[in-house]
């Protein structure tokens, strides 16, 4: 499955939108930094068959979409930027879902690498727990926004590697 060129443009647009979403000076949030334990090893792209890599990417985008679709998120971010960001993520999910169906048929492998999917889910659970503990403060959201930008960058790099394998 070849992810369309529009998919990588969508990735870039999503990152740009996320960068634009900042509402407070992030310099005031230094002490709120937190180790969310991003599962970097799940995104190095070496140990995966393509179908498994795509399913991990799908989970990453799905969880990001879920995180930014909550009421708390709506209260934290400028609405039009948030809607555009969610739309980009939704389009990426559609692209990835189409690819998952194709790849599973080709490789005849299980849909998901369960351990990798679980690692991504636990990562987002830690993010949600952090936001809850910080009472969804502006700085907590800034830290999470920075973290998601970093994790989406890893996702983008994995997608680039997958395209090079084609």
């Amino acid at each position: 499955c070849d992810l369309p060129q529009t998919h990588s443009l969508g990735n870039r647009r999503a990152l740009i939108l996320l960068a634009q979403m900042g509402r407070i000076s992030h310099f005031s949030c230094l002490k709120d930094r937190h180790d969310f334990g991003f599962p970097e090893e799940e995104f190095d792209g070496h140990q995966f068959q393509k179908a498994q890599a795509i399913s991990v990417l799908h989970e990453m985008i799905q969880q990001t979409f879920n995180l930014f679709s909550t009421e708390d998120s709506s209260a934290a971010w400028e609405q039009s930027l948030l809607e555009k960001f969610s739309t980009e993520l939704y389009q990426q999910l559609n692209d990835l879902e189409a690819c998952v169906i194709q790849e599973v048929g080709v490789e005849e492998t299980p849909l998901m690498n369960e351990d990798s999917i679980l690692a991504v889910r636990k990562y987002f659970q830690r993010i949600t727990l952090y936001l809850t503990e910080k009472k969804y403060s502006p700085c907590a959201w800034e830290v999470v926004r920075a973290e998601i930008m970093r994790s989406l960058s890893f996702s983008t790099n994995l997608q680039k590697r997958l395209r090079r394998k084609d």
């Epitope: 310099f27 002490k31 930094r33 180790d35 969310f36 920075a146």
Partner: antibody, heavy 121, light 107 residues
Framework: EVQLVQSGAEVKKPGESLKISCKGS????????IGWVRQMPGKGLEWMGI????????AYSPSFQGQVTISADKSISTAYLQWSSLKASDTAMYYC??????????????WGQGTLVTVSS | DIQMTQSPSSLSASVGDRVTITCRAS??????LNWYQQKPGKAPKLLIY???SLQSGVPSRFSGSGSGTDFTLTISSLQPEDFATYYC?????????FGQGTKVEIK
Amino acid sequence: EVQLVQSGAEVKKPGESLKISCKGSGYSFTSYWIGWVRQMPGKGLEWMGIIDPSDSDTAYSPSFQGQVTISADKSISTAYLQWSSLKASDTAMYYCARHPGLNWAPDFDYWGQGTLVTVSS
Amino acid sequence: DIQMTQSPSSLSASVGDRVTITCRASQSIDEFLNWYQQKPGKAPKLLIYFASSLQSGVPSRFSGSGSGTDFTLTISSLQPEDFATYYCQQAHSFPLTFGQGTKVEIK
């Protein structure tokens, strides 16, 4: 390979202006902040200020606020430190260093080689 | 501003010695404390970040500990290349501040 390459040594007269540079390579320039640190001859390290190249937001140490200006041009992955009117007391080595921003990663993990600024009449 | 106080300001030690440098913050900084090594004419080098995490490529003889206001950098067995000046730096809030430095000299 991550690198921060600073502009060369400068010799200036009091009252002159100056802009020194720090060019980042080998990483996503807008994903890290760039900090500036002063070291006067035989003295310790002093943090001057920092810039987020993604939006050019800046923060300064109160000691340096109004004395220097930090800027960045993300199109050429370069941060700048400038003076509008140098004083003899600005004679020092100036370092730039990258900072991970709000991410949980090592602070100031890569440094430039330093730019020696000498101000003398 | 958060004041950082290092002690001692200088020390003399021999190769193989265990060396301890302390750093105290004027208010709690949790674990937001970094340690740097600087040799004459060179840029500082990050050794330890977030109080106890060893920076990639730094020898394991270097270790950091502490939280709140009191922190320690330990060199378990001093090597010839370790003679340098060491700085702590709080990473808790702006303005970032450094300790005044500890010069480790050959006895």
